[in-house]
């Protein structure tokens, strides 16, 4: 039950995280005009990974896409790549984890297969989260560097009294969304990996010892300490040992209150 809960929670947390990564990637507010200690302007600038926008105090907002690919800074391209890789890995991870969920039955899929899929999706979520965190952190570092550079030359003299003000940019909302989303995806991935350990069949093999009494046979199975008699409706559980410990779900193959479809 705990394994199912951990796996389910890991899936949900990762789903929220990946949705957040997608949202952050699409958001325009990766960097926003720094309003502190700046001359008060009637326009507000903000930039995303794909376009830059200007909101005038009149209420009019104008956004322009970065239509060039080669003319963009390498760091921006790197951030774009990291975020896209994060989204792609996360999406594949989600797809894999749906089939790996213990509460979903697909044919006669073995628990070992589900365990492998859970581990795979977990690793994908971890890498996806790391990509998002790395992307956002690279962008944030770029902003910090540019911020201090533009603070150093905040006013660029252009001869005489004429001055031109450099627009300084600070962290936008998308950075915080990205960090939180990346963290959630990472946590979800770790939870999936933990759930995988609970799903995986134990490798330790025990010799099953049968004691034959004169009346009726009772077999003792050391793994789960479950006894089964050779009589009545339980005769289909006669095969006691089959190379490793089995989960209750596998032993009791007829529907029970513990089965979720």
């Amino acid at each position: 039950m705990a394994v199912t809960a951990c796996q389910g929670l890991g899936f949900v947390v990762s789903l929220i995280g990946i949705a957040g990564i997608i949202a952050a990637t699409c958001m325009d507010q990766w960097s926003t005009q720094d309003l502190y200690n700046n001359p008060v302007t009637a326009v507000f600038n903000y930039q995303g990974l794909w376009r830059s926008c200007v909101r005038e105090s009149s209420g009019f907002t104008e956004c322009r896409g970065y239509f060039t690919l080669l003319g963009l800074p390498a760091m921006l391209q790197a951030v774009r790549a990291l975020m896209i890789v994060g989204i792609v890995l996360g999406a594949i991870g989600l797809l894999v984890s749906i089939f790996a969920l213990k509460c979903i039955r697909i044919g006669s899929m073995e628990d070992s297969a589900k365990a492998n899929m859970t581990l795979t999706s977990g690793i994908m979520f971890i890498v996806s989260g790391l990509c998002a965190i790395a992307g956002v952190s690279v962008f944030a570092n770029m902003l910090v560097t540019n911020f201090w550079m533009s603070t150093a030359n905040m006013y660029t003299g252009m001869g005489g009294m004429v001055q031109t003000v450099q627009t300084r940019y600070t962290f936008g909302a998308a950075l915080f969304v990205g960090w939180v989303a990346g963290g959630l995806t990472l946590i979800g991935g770790v939870m999936m990996c933990i759930a995988c350990r609970g799903l995986a069949p134990e490798e330790t093999n025990y010799k099953a010892v049968s004691y034959h009494a004169s009346g009726h046979s009772v077999a003792y199975k050391p793994g789960g300490f479950k006894a089964s008699t050779g009589f009545g409706s339980n005769t289909k559980n006669k095969k006691i040992y089959d190379g490793g410990a089995r989960t209750e779900d596998e032993v009791q193959s007829y529907p029970s209150k513990h089965d979720y479809v």
Epitope: Q33, P39, V40, T41, A42, V43, N45, Y46, Q47, S52, C53, V54, E56, S57, S58, G59, F60, E62, R64, M158, V162, Q163, T164, V165, Q166, T167
Partner: antibody, heavy 117, light 113 residues
């Protein structure tokens, strides 16, 4: 069509205050900023401040304490109160609505305020 | 505050002539975010409120005759009337629409001979 209708001319005593109104029609009042501009007779234009109905105000430092901008969304009317009037406050006061580029596209007809003993 | 300097303060021309007036700001009105210059030109005829002619330094407001052209960038701006008409008799103001407080130039008075 968009219209800004200002209140009539005022003749006031020095030291008193006056409230000029600007009734907007033909557009969603809450969505646009209303600027106020002063023009002394035969002089140039001077920006007083701006109000966003329901949001906030921004004043020219030279008019802080002199002008108070308010708005009543229910009647789509902007107001400017001028206090402690002196002869320097005798001017035509315009209200105007902002447009692209923060430009002032629609103007009221102006309200002449005369401060005289 | 941004200082807007207009020149000449007045000029007298004959109908059909080309007229150029300039406006200089103490700081650049160019916004790096959208590469637009936040400078506006107004025309004020006697006894009337100002009328918007040009915004973003060069974008003509709808309904404004195409003889009015705005140009310039950064700190230096120009308003050109390609062929002056009798109805163009007015005072022309430039305005900084970028920095608060918004500031107007002292105006250029256009008179027709």
């Amino acid at each position: 069509q968009v219209q800004l209708q200002q209140s009539g001319a005022e003749l006031v005593r020095p030291g008193t205050s006056v409230k000029v109104s600007c009734k907007a029609s033909g557009y969603a009042f809450s969505n646009y900023l209303i600027d106020w501009v002063k023009q002394r007779p035969g002089q140039g234009l001077e920006w007083i401040g701006v109000i966003h109905p329901g949001s906030g105000t921004n004043y020219n430092e030279n008019f802080k304490g002199k002008a108070t901008l308010t708005a009543d969304k229910s009647s789509s009317t902007a107001y400017m109160q001028l206090s402690s009037l002196t002869s320097d406050d005798s001017a035509v006061y315009f209200c105007s609505r902002r447009w692209y580029g923060n430009s002032l596209i629609y103007w009221g007809q102006g309200t002449l305020v005369t401060v005289s003993a | 505050d941004i200082v807007m300097t207009q020149s000449p303060s007045s000029l007298t021309v004959t109908a059909g002539e080309k007229v150029t007036m300039t406006c200089k700001s103490s700081q650049s009105l160019l916004n790096s975010g959208n590469q637009r210059n936040y400078l506006t030109w107004y025309q004020q005829k006697p006894g009337q409120p100002p009328k918007l002619l040009i915004y973003w330094a060069s974008t003509r407001e709808s309904g404004v005759p195409d003889r009015f052209t705005g140009s310039g960038s950064g700190t230096d701006f120009t308003l050109t009337i390609s062929s002056v008409q009798a109805e163009d008799l007015a005072v022309y103001y430039c305005q900084n629409d970028y920095f608060y407080p918004f500031t107007f130039g002292s105006g250029t008075k256009l008179e027709i001979k």
